[in-house]
Interface confidence: low
């Protein structure tokens, strides 16, 4: 730990400030993982001015960095971007005349206190006081800054010509299209200073390449995947101020396919375990040794878990016997195609015959996703029922 | 060696003015907050304030707050303990200090009588 | 009224281990490093420990000091006669931006 410091497994605490130091803390080699430290605080160090570009980004966990009564004139524009974890940054009483945007935009900041510092008024720091304005919290910060006249003036009072947010307009604020096809969006942006564009496509997987002028930008997104349904597409407009965005989702419509079709597992019922991939959502229809299962309370589709186009769920059955054993069939079916698997299902041997479980389908107990949604599918077809199971257990109480 | 050595005793009179001094050397005197304790006869130590030399940054405990100056001239690497008007409560023992501690000025004994 | 708290008096016998109280807040003890200081009549206060529990070079390893919450705590085991003096605690204090100190604790060797 270095010297003026005391460190723990998770923090960092420089707040003596004799002797001081010159840098920000690092760790030695062979001491504590800087992984695992989310606060540091340091406090009166006069003599600590700069934070360079590496000296935080080993501490990728951080979430809280106040720097106070010290000397910190200037931050490097990348000093923070290996920080995304960071929440808090307290900067009171340092010497910084300025400080840019850039530091944070990355950041999902709740709190950047920045009272005492010697702010220059400039277009630069606009953008606290534009900060400062979208906070609805009333302890707002008694922020200044000097003029040219080297006079204290509150930054809530700062006017500076030509010195205001950007806008972002995109065309199309919905946007449905087909698995395979391709788009292209438009957006335009304006401001003064004139603002920078560029697209926030996240982790988009879909083939996309951009063309940007510097008021009008395009994206065209081809061959588009059902990977990047529910994802959103930004059209952002950057300056020394802030930013605007303007987005919109993506929605992709696909064919359904069934990833996952498994033999029964044995939990608190009986569990045909499955996962359907679709957009829209796909009806369900199971088969029994070929004819409509008709579902009743003691054999039913629950689905657990719904994740956007993604559906996992259980074909559930209550005390099967050695007559629901057989083949069945899943399939999947919307208006861009139908998928459909199937699996032999051996739930007990005949009396007399086969006592035990077959050993082919041992008891692996399937992980219960915990909340039952709604069934998908329509079972009005009651013809060719499969035998019923049993209906009560020992209390005599009905499943 | 890394030594603060402080001005003499003063003897002074009800209403008159003093400025005491702290002289640092063998350190980088302008890198380090300079403190002054005061100690009234009998009593215990008391933070009167504390000067960086560096910016000259002040920071006065409350109850001296308004009663005494501390300054610094970090080109002759000294500080210094001023009073406007000295009143006969002032009789004390001064120390000056580099906070962290490991430094003492000897003590300057200040005593206030008519 | 000092803004750390000592008892103002403590006593031991020769040989004997004596315990000195300092208690704080979160503001000074709660979030910063104490130091303690020993101080003989007609001198100026010594560094005694520093960092909480840190001794300077020179200090006997007798003296140790610690730290739980908003107290600390200086320890001095087998107490010889040379150890009679004023101990006073100290920390640093964020909400008055400067040093604080405890009102001292004389300790005396029976």
């Known amino acids: 730990c270095p010297t003026s410091c005391k460190c723990s497994a998770s923090r960092i605490w420089c707040s003596d400030p004799s002797p001081g130091i010159v840098a920000f803390p690092r760790l030695e080699p062979n001491s504590v993982d800087p992984e695992n430290i989310t606060e540091i605080f340091i406090a009166n160090q006069k003599r600590l001015e700069i934070i360079n570009e590496d000296d935080v980004e080993a501490y990728v966990g951080l979430r809280n960095l106040t720097i106070v009564d010290s000397g910190l004139k200037f931050v490097a524009h990348k000093a923070f971007l290996k920080n995304s974890n960071l929440q808090h940054i307290n900067f009171t009483r340092n010497k910084l005349t300025s400080l840019s945007r850039k530091h944070f935009r990355h950041l999902d900041l709740s709190e950047l206190i920045l009272v005492g510092n010697p702010f220059t008024c400039s277009c630069d720091i606009m953008w606290i006081k534009t900060l400062q304005e979208a906070k609805s919290s009333p302890d707002t910060q008694d922020l200044y800054c000097l003029n040219e006249s080297s006079k204290n003036i509150p930054l809530a009072n700062l006017q500076i010509p030509n010195c205001g947010l950007p806008s972002a307009n995109l065309a199309a604020p919905n946007l449905t299209v087909e698995e395979g096809k391709s788009i292209t969006l438009s957006c335009s942006v304006a401001g003064d200073p004139v603002p920078n564009m560029y697209w926030d496509v996240g982790n988009l997987v879909s083939k996309h390449m951009n063309e940007t002028s510097h008021t009008q930008g395009s994206l065209r997104i081809t061959n588009i995947s059902s990977d990047d349904s529910g994802k959103q597409i930004s059209c952002v407009a950057e300056n020394l101020v802030g930013e605007d965005q303007d987005s919109v989702n993506l929605t992709v419509h696909f064919a359904p396919t069934i990833t996952f079709l498994e033999s029964p597992t044995s939990d608190h019922h009986w569990c045909i375990p499955f996962t359907v991939k679709g957009n829209p959502k796909p009806a369900l229809q199971w088969f029994y040794n070929g004819a409509i299962l008709n579902e009743s309370k003691y054999i039913c589709t629950k689905i657990h878990v719904t994740n956007h186009t993604e559906y996992h769920g259980c074909l559930q059955l209550d005390n099967p016997t050695h007559m629901n054993n057989g083949d069945y069939t899943l399939i999947a079916k919307n208006e861009y195609g139908k998928d459909e698997k199937q699996i032999s299902a051996h739930f007990m041997g005949w009396p007399g015959i086969d006592d035990g479980a077959n050993p082919n389908y041992p008891d692996v107990i399937y992980e219960d996703y915990g909340t039952a949604a709604n069934d998908i599918g329509d079972t009005t077809n009651r013809s060719n029922e499969i035998p019923s199971t049993d209906v009560t257990d020992k209390t005599g109480r009905e499943h | 060696e890394v030594q603060l050595v402080q001005s003499g005793a003063e003897v002074k009179k009800p209403g008159e003015s003093l400025k005491i001094s702290c002289k640092g050397s063998?350190?980088?005197?302008?890198?380090?907050?300079i403190g002054w304790v005061r100690q009234m006869p009998g009593k215990g130590l008391e933070w009167m304030g504390i000067i960086y030399p560096g910016d000259s940054d002040t920071r006065y405990s409350p109850s001296f707050q308004g009663q005494v100056t501390i300054s610094a001239d970090k080109s002759i690497s000294t500080a210094y303990l001023q009073w406007s008007s000295l009143k006969a409560s002032d009789t004390a023992m001064y120390y000056c200090a580099s906070w962290g501690m490991d430094v003492w000025g000897q003590g300057t004994l200040v005593t206030v009588s008519s | 009224q000092p803004v750390l708290t000592q008892p103002p008096s403590a006593s031991g016998t020769p040989g004997q281990r004596v315990t000195i109280s300092c208690s704080g807040s979160s503001s000074n003890i709660g979030t910063h490093t104490v130091n303690w200081y020993q101080q003989f009549p007609g001198t100026a206060p010594k560094l005694l420990m520093y960092s909480t529990f840190q001794r300077p070079s020179g200090v006997p390893d007798r003296f140790s000091g610690s730290k739980s919450g908003t107290s600390a705590s200086l320890a001095i085991s087998g107490l010889q006669s040379e150890d009679e003096a004023d101990y006073y605690c100290a920390a640093w204090d964020d909400s008055l931006n400067g040093p604080v100190f405890g009102g001292g604790t004389q300790l005396t060797v029976l």
């Open positions: 063998g350190y980088s005197f302008t890198s380090y907050w």
